[in-house]
Interface confidence: low
């Protein structure tokens, strides 16, 4: 009938009872008319059920789009929403009708026996028990059993709504087997149908395989894989396994629930797959799937099956490792093998033990590599079952960036006499040896600190414009000698020397050494003075307990007031705008010393004597003199080094040796110590006397026995002695062969 109507905006259908809620008594007739602008339909409570035959919907006699709904003799169960709507639209008018039946205040469900409420135990979830009411303002409580518990609306999380039912936090009734609603009317109790409480869960938290990875076996061994599913409570789990050889004879699957701690919020299920004797066809991917119906989670692992136990080095195993001093070195033992091998590391044949500097395990780790770690490292892998062994040698080369020996003698400026020839030295130790050592220079006044420049202890010279020594214009005439190579303290060092032909100008000189792993530099302050001159008597470097005199000589006609000072222990402060070593300008850091004055025809000589020099006497000594005319102070600094007394030690070992009669034996015994020790040789504890066949050279360091005889066999001892004691090494020389008879016998 609505076909062809113009497309105008529709008004809501209009109900004959203009109320949202209508309350009527049971056994009366409900009649509502609905009018609109196009075809209408009605919806009413339970209109999917057989109760439809009581409900009558008729066309109105007085209008085109009008329908009347009639229910004679209404009952409590007719309570609910009555809706009149335009077909195929959302436009509707609704009235909620309460049929007040005090004998049946709750609207019965369709089944009329019992309902089911599904709940989860989540603390934050609420559940609605659908006990709708035929009366809007009932006092309803919820009864749960067993044990019996009653819940009443609290105006917060527990409530009852006649159109919706009873709302309550689900955890409050999760213990119960059943619940029902109860209303009290005039001291009479009325109950809704029973609702069975079903606590459900579906969530699987995780599925874990154990072992989880790296499973390796050899043919015939047993495989046991555990699959554990962790779920929320009240979940049932089905396990499903997928594996390579499904037709396995010896396969066994066991599923069980695991006990969890009381109060735990989760359940655990375990499925164990066992294959008693694996074959090569059992190699592959094993997948365990756990399903709760609403959710499935799975996990996989790869099982490798070897024909037999074996061990081999992996292709990535290094043969050469290069490192720089101070670095952390890691040499992993890369292997293929089953079962995992026992790993033992050796250095030059000696077993390595783990300590705080080295860890010898699957990875050989040297925490802070030093030169002495250079060498051949052997890793031996042993299969624990077959005892098969594999070995591999890794050469470790430790590089050392250039270190300049003299750099450690950090001292203020030594002063150099005007016009003298001087040699400056840089002794460089580096592995590999430096590929170049270059010298640079700069005038002292050009390198004075600008007020804006900060000076650090590590770089006290903020000089930037270094000039090559080839360009010595305006400076001292220089010659760089060819590098020398020397064995110093048992190390091969490169010595570079720079010769200053005549000390005319104060300058700074820098040597710079570079090798493949770094660079090192030393700045030498070359301060030229026309002032006093310091000499040491009797020696440049005294040993402790020896006596030494420092002589300061100055021209009497030019200088006066000669004074000896010693620099205090704290480093000289460098003030902005001054030269790197302003000793004369800063007498606060100096200690005045007692000294004796001598004079000859031209010079004053101030002698400061140190009797029984000790290590505490080391340091920088300053001689200060004043210009008679200008009163300007001149000072010269000399660093005094006192050598420590060191008991004799013998480096290296004498080796036992076997020699045939008539051959020669040559052995050396290198001793060190301060004062230098005397070396003596003994045979069978008796002093060895030189003769035509026994030759001692180089201060007895080298012993040669020419054309050895049977009587030369015995225990040879090299002994190095000084006032501080003795050191000795021994070796047994065995002489083989028959002694030839001589004509004299």
């Amino acid at each position: 009938a609505s076909v062809g109507l113009p497309s105008v905006s529709l008004d809501l259908p209009r109900l004959s009872i203009q109320k949202d809620i209508l309350t009527i008594k049971a056994n009366t007739t409900l009649q509502i008319t609905c009018r609109g602008q196009r075809d209408l339909d009605w919806l009413w409570p339970n209109n999917q059920s057989g109760s439809e035959q009581r409900v009558e919907v008729t066309e109105c006699s007085d209008g085109l789009f009008c329908k009347t709904l009639t229910i004679p003799k209404v009952i409590g169960n007719d309570t609910g929403a009555y809706k009149c709507f335009y077909r195929e639209t959302d436009l509707a008018s609704v009235i909620y009708v309460y049929v007040q039946d005090y004998r049946s205040p709750f609207i019965a469900s369709v089944s009329d026996q019992h309902g089911v409420v599904y709940i989860t135990e989540n603390k934050n979830k609420t559940v609605v028990i659908p006990c709708l009411g035929s009366i809007s303002n009932l006092n309803v409580s919820l009864c749960a059993r067993y044990p019996e518990k009653r819940f009443v609306p609290d105006g917060n999380r527990i409530s009852w709504d006649s159109k919706k039912g009873f709302t309550i936090p689900s955890y409050m009734i999760s213990y119960a087997g059943m619940v029902f609603c109860e209303a009290k009317i005039n001291d009479e109790s009325y109950q809704s149908i029973m609702y069975i409480v079903v606590v459900v869960g579906y969530r699987i938290y995780d599925v874990v395989l154990s072992p989880s990875h790296g499973i390796e076996l050899s043919v015939g061994e047993k495989l046991v894989l555990n699959c554990t599913a962790r779920t929320e409570l009240n979940v049932g789990i089905d396990f499903n396994w997928e594996y390579p050889s499904s037709k396995h004879q010896h396969k066994k699957l066991v599923n069980r629930d695991l006990k969890t701690q009381s109060g735990s919020e989760m359940k655990k299920f375990l499925s164990t797959l066992t294959i008693d004797g694996v074959t090569r066809s059992d190699q592959g991917l094993y997948t365990c799937a756990a399903s709760s119906g609403l959710m499935t989670k799975k996990n996989s692992t790869f099982v490798r099956v070897h024909e037999k136990p074996f061990v081999a080095f992996g292709s990535g195993m290094e043969s050469l490792v290069e490192a720089t001093v101070g670095e952390r070195v890691r040499i992993p033992a890369k292997y293929l093998g089953y079962p995992p091998p026992e790993i033992k590391w050796y250095k030059n044949g000696i077993p390595l033990e783990s300590n705080h500097t080295i860890k010898a395990g699957h990875v050989l780790t040297i925490m802070e590599v030093s030169e002495r770690d250079t060498g051949n490292y052997t890793v031996i892998l042993t299969n624990p079952i077959s005892k098969e062994k594999q070995s591999h040698v890794v050469s470790l080369v430790v590089y050392v960036p250039p270190q300049i020996g003299e750099k450690s003698l950090i001292s203020p400026v030594d002063s150099y006499q005007y016009g003298t020839t001087q040699t400056l030295t840089c002794t460089v130790y580096a592995i590999p040896p430096p590929h170049h050592i270059h010298w640079y220079w700069q005038l002292e006044e050009e390198c004075a600190n600008e007020p804006s420049q900060a000076v650090s202890v590590t770089n006290p010279y903020p000089c930037e414009e270094w000039r090559s020594v080839e360009d010595f214009q305006g400076g001292n005439k220089i010659e760089v000698n060819k590098n020398q190579f020397a064995l110093i303290e048992g190390k091969n060092k490169t010595v570079s020397t720079l010769v200053i032909q005549a000390a005319n100008v104060s300058a700074l000189y820098k040597c710079e050494a570079v090798n493949k792993v770094g660079r090192g530099e030393r700045v030498i302050s070359f301060h030229v003075t026309r002032g006093p001159e310091i000499t040491l008597q009797p020696d440049m470097q005294p040993t402790e307990q020896e006596s030494v005199s420092l002589w300061c000589t100055a021209d009497r006609s030019t200088f006066e007031n000669l004074t000896w000072y010693k620099l205090g222990p704290q480093p000289l402060p460098i003030h902005v705008g001054e030269l790197p070593t302003p000793v004369c300008k800063n007498l606060d850091t100096l200690w005045k010393l007692n000294a004796t004055m001598f004079s000859n025809s031209t010079n004053d000589i101030l002698i400061m004597e140190l009797k029984n020099a000790s290590l505490q006497d080391q340091g920088d000594y300053v001689c200060l003199a004043q210009d008679r005319k200008t009163k300007k102070r001149h000072c010269v600094v000399r660093q005094l080094t006192v050598l420590e007394r060191v008991a004799p030690t013998i480096t290296g070992n004498l080796e036992n040796q076997t020699t045939s009669i008539g051959e020669s034996i040559e052995v050396s015994c290198t001793a060190s110590g301060n004062p230098p020790p005397q070396i003596m040789w003994f045979k069978d504890n008796e002093t060895l006397v030189e003769d035509s066949g026994i030759v001692l050279k180089d201060g007895n360091r080298n012993l040669t026995i020419r054309r050895v005889r049977k009587e030369d066999e015995g225990l040879y001892t090299c002994q190095a002695c000084s006032v501080l004691g003795c050191a000795k090494v021994e070796a047994f020389f065995i002489i083989e062969g028959a002694q030839e008879k001589t004509n004299l016998e």
Partner: antibody, heavy 123, light 111 residues
Amino acid sequence: QVQLVESGAEVKKPGASVKVSCKASGYTFTSYYMHWVRQAPGQGLEWMGIINPSGGSTSYAQKFQGRVTMTRDTSTSTVYMELSSLRSEDTAVYYCAREGANAPNSYYYMDVWGKGTTVTVSS
Amino acid sequence: QSVVTQPPSVSGAPGQRVTISCTGSSSNIGAGYDVHWYKQLPGTAPKLLIYGNNNRPSGVPDRFSGSKSGTSASLAITGLQAEDEADYYCQSYDSSLSEGVFGTGTKVTVL
């Protein structure tokens, strides 16, 4: 040649302690482990413990735990074995023995032995 | 009580072959640890005879040989000689005790 020289015979009272020394020569002392083994009169060999002369680490047989102490002095290439709370059943010959180094996985084999020190415990 | 056992004595005529057994368990010989053999003459220190199951140190005649299988090992002496009369001890390492273990010892008599 490689030699292990032990200290002289000792007679001790029950409850006392004994310290036996073993001086090594002819090889690099810190490169080889040292074992102590004892043999009671008419009985078999009994392993007591091992010391690493390089680091000084030790491992003792459970039977002697708490009573035995093994130490070394690298400056004299000497190892020491001290046994305390002596009882008559500790009467035995005490040997020091160097561990061989030919086979990396051959644990605890002894290629050079000292002549032994006789310790007699008697009241 | 030793965890590694040997027969108390074996004997043989000169020129004969004798074997000494050495029985351990899964924590020593059976765990793969090597077996070593020592010879001890009366009143002297033991001397290494075989190391690493079957290796002879220099100076030991090839009449002596060692073998190992499972949890036991054996020492064979072929062409028995008068100077072979001595006590023989096997030795291994026990991982459960974490210590070296000697066998009970076997006296070899040359008839």
